[in-house]
């Protein structure tokens, strides 16, 4: 940007600028061009022997220049234009300034005036243009600083040149008020720092709801002495509610939301949210939506799931398999998991309790993913319940629960009681017993053993009867034991495991039993 | 020295024709804008028309225009004016004049011309 | 066209005397104007151009000045050769028209 502190064309000839010596030499004269009037200041005294004729500007304020720009247009006769070449004459001026506080007025004195250059034209005017009106314009331009008082003069200095000066425009240069990145530049004055740092290093602020972001840089820019904004460094994003329109932040519009400072635009509120009003960071879930903390906002509002489906119990003697099917509705989310739980009551006294700690499940029967689970280590004469509750990344959120219950009934035998018999260096002769009313129930029994320590195998047998010799045994090695009744509806109740151990080859008649 | 002598003056009847002629002699002739002015008896100055150094361009007055052709040759040094259509109020001495710009002192030309030399003058007269 | 008006029409004066003869221009000529004197039955001769510069060759007792639309014709001490009829032409336009004539007479 150009600030202009002197227009002498754009003044049409208003200025009365000081001419000395008074009435000789420069004279302020109107001519057409291009059917336009214009002003200049002339002189063609080419043959009147030596010339000193100066022509100064009016006083003009400095503002905040430090150093000024001085453009000259000006047209230059050719000597040989004249008859004889007129012997005195020249084709160059001189350009002078004087710096000063007060304006002089009419008091003119050459002495306060320090020269800025000799003024050449590129381009003279021969006598062919001349005659056909074809003004060859120069154009120079010449800087003057730093400048220091509050204002200055500029004079020129005839020699003996025909010449017409149509313009003279002083101006300094500034970088102009700037928008970049959402941060707003001041009107800067274009000045070299120094002669090594050509570059004035100007802070950007942040245009209304924008910020700088987190760890980010501030935004700053570069004013060259040229008066152009160079080097952008950092910048400005639109804070949450807003987004960047242009140059500027606008509010979300309503139904739209922004959570945080981005380059992003603002997003339409998503599902089962209520109409969000202007400028909105978040989206308010509808009632009974919810939002996971870690759910991001631009994620739709969910909902707890509802109950898993089809849920039945199939029992097989002790055991009993669960199998259910995905909730209806899964709440709009894809993160459901069930959890089993297990109530165990006594048809005789109707008692009930939780029994968790006495059946054995097939999985961790928390945040299970599959639809199915198998229960085993179930008591005879027991009805039991289980509740299959689906939940996902919002079901923390409610107090309610979605479960479906299945009931069981087990009505296997009990556990036989066992006990050692015999042994031997390499043999355990092992006894068992039922109650008599469910003898009739069992049609074998399965004898599972193995080594203590060694999970790795077993051995069963299967016997009709209530006993059973274990043969082919390591001597003074204890083995773990257990029996099951196998019944027409299954696998009865297992036995608990007992640890029998064979004799040492010293040979010991004590039983572990 | 600048010297200018018209010829081809005489007396016209309205409506007939006549060729001036400027000779020119002890100056550079292509260097001169030429031009022709007229002065009725008794009366002011009036310019009729102008041309260039080396032919163009060529202007003349309102009175005129149509009717009045300004010529020259510069191998011959010779400026024309030829009039057709002549009217009695073109009765007058006609004047051949010339300009250079050499002498005229100034930056920027002036948009039109001043008249720094001049001949005697040849008198037409438009009569029946 | 420009109209040039020039006063007095005629005047009378002595050897001697200061003449200052004006023409006015109907619109503003900056300084594009020339000074001519004719003697009777003689060509016009150039005394100013650019309203104040002396022609070559003319003495310096003619001097011009003025510019806009108001400009005179100074002779400051009239000489017996000076007695003609002076016209102010402007150039300002391609019309160039003359002022009708000042005739300065002996008294």
């Known amino acids: 940007k150009e600030v202009v502190l002197l227009d002498f064309a754009a003044m049409k000839g208003e200025l009365g600028w000081l001419t000395h010596p008074y009435g000789k030499g420069w004279d302020l004269m109107q001519n057409i061009m291009d059917d336009m009037p214009i002003y200049m200041y002339s002189v063609c005294n080419v043959v009147s022997g030596d010339q000193d004729n100066w022509l100064r500007t009016n006083w003009v304020y400095r503002e905040e220049a430090e150093r000024i720009f001085i453009e000259l247009k000006f047209t230059v006769r050719d000597c040989n234009s004249f008859p004889g070449g007129a012997s005195s004459c020249k084709e160059t001026f001189n350009l002078y300034y004087a710096e000063s506080d007060v304006d002089y007025g009419t008091n003119f004195q050459k002495r306060q005036f320090t020269k800025i250059d000799t003024i050449a034209p590129d381009e003279i005017t021969v006598s062919s243009d001349f005659e056909a009106r074809n003004v060859k314009l120069n154009v120079e331009e010449r800087m003057v600083g730093p400048l220091t008082r509050k204002g200055f003069y500029l004079a020129f200095q005839d020699i003996g040149a025909c010449v017409a000066l149509l313009s003279v425009r002083v101006y300094y240069k500034k970088c102009p008020e700037m928008l970049q990145s959402l941060a707003r530049f001041p009107e800067t004055i274009a000045v070299a720092v120094s002669d090594t740092q050509p570059l004035a290093t100007v802070a950007g602020t942040c245009v209304d709801h924008a910020v700088v972001p987190y760890g980010g840089e501030g935004p700053l820019m570069h004013c060259t002495v040229d008066g152009e904004w160079l080097v952008p460094i950092g910048q400005c994003l639109c804070q949450e509610g807003y987004e960047k329109v242009e140059d500027a932040c606008r509010a979300c519009s309503p139904g739209f939301f922004k959570s945080e400072a981005s380059e992003s635009p603002c997003l339409e509120c998503p599902e089962h949210t209520l109409p969000s009003t202007e400028g909105a960071t978040s989206c308010q879930c509808e009632e009974g939506y919810f939002r996971a903390p870690e759910d991001p906002l631009s994620m739709s509002c969910t909902r707890p799931p509802s109950a898993p489906n089809y849920l039945t119990a199939i029992g097989m003697g002790a055991k009993v398999e669960l199998r259910w099917t995905a909730p209806k509705d899964t709440g709009g989310r894809q993160d459901i998991v069930y959890s089993v739980t297990c109530e165990q009551c006594w048809p005789e006294s109707g008692e009930c309790g939780p029994c968790e700690a006495s059946v054995r499940y097939s999985e961790p029967p928390h945040a299970l993913t599959r639809t199915s689970v198998t229960v085993s280590d179930l008591e005879p004469h027991m009805n039991y319940t289980f509740a299959v509750e689906a939940r996902n990344g919002v079901s923390g959120l409610v107090t309610s629960r979605s479960f479906r219950t299945a009931s069981v009934s087990i009505n296997q035998t009990e556990p036989p009681k066992v006990r050692l018999e015999d042994r031997s260096t390499t043999s355990l002769s092992v006894t068992w017993s039922i109650p008599v009313s469910q003898q009739s129930r069992v049609w074998k029994y399965e004898v599972t053993y193995r080594k203590k320590g060694d999970a790795n195998s077993y051995n069963v047998r299967r016997t009709e009867g209530f006993s059973v010799t274990l043969d082919d045994l390591a001597p003074d090695t204890t083995y773990l034991v257990q029996v099951q009744a196998l019944t027409q509806e299954g696998q009865g109740a297992g036995s608990k495991v007992h640890e029998f151990q064979t004799l040492s080859t010293e040979g010991s008649a004590n039983m572990a039993v | 020295e600048v010297q200018l002598l018209e010829s081809g003056g005489g007396l016209v009847q309205p409506g007939g024709s006549l060729r001036l002629s400027c000779a020119a002699s002890?100056?550079?002739?292509?260097?001169?804008?030429m031009a022709w002015v007229r002065q009725a008896p008794g009366k002011g100055l009036e310019w009729v028309s102008r041309?260039?150094?080396?032919?163009?361009?060529?202007h003349y007055a309102d009175s005129v225009k149509g009717r009045f052709t300004i010529s020259r040759d510069n191998s011959k040094n010779t400026l024309y004016l030829q009039m057709n259509s002549l009217r009695a109020e073109d009765t007058a001495v006609y004047y051949c004049?010339?300009?250079?710009?050499?002498?005229?002192?100034?930056?920027?030309?002036?948009?039109?011309?001043?008249?720094?030399?001049w001949g005697q003058g040849t008198l037409v007269t438009v009569s029946s | 066209d420009i109209q040039m008006t020039q006063s007095p029409s005629s005047l009378s004066a002595s050897v001697g005397d200061r003449v200052t003869i004006t023409c006015r221009a109907s619109?503003?000529?900056?300084?594009?104007l020339a000074w001519y004197q004719q003697k009777p039955g003689k060509a016009p001769k150039l005394l100013i151009y650019?309203?104040?510069n002396l022609h070559t060759g003319v003495p310096s007792r003619f001097s011009g000045s003025g510019s806009g639309t108001e400009f005179t014709l100074t002779i400051s001490g009239l000489q017996p050769d000076d007695f003609a009829t002076y016209y102010c032409?402007?150039?300002?336009?391609?019309?160039?028209?003359f002022g009708q004539g000042t005739k300065v007479e002996i008294k």
């Open positions: 002890g100056f550079t002739f292509s260097h001169y804008m």
């Open positions: 032409q402007q150039y300002n336009s391609y019309s160039r028209t």
């Open positions: 650019k309203a104040s």
């Open positions: 004049a010339g300009y250079d710009s050499g002498y005229d002192y100034v930056a920027v030309a002036g948009p039109a011309e001043y008249f720094q030399h």
């Open positions: 619109q503003s000529i900056s300084t594009w």
């Open positions: 041309i260039g150094p080396s032919g163009g361009p060529t």
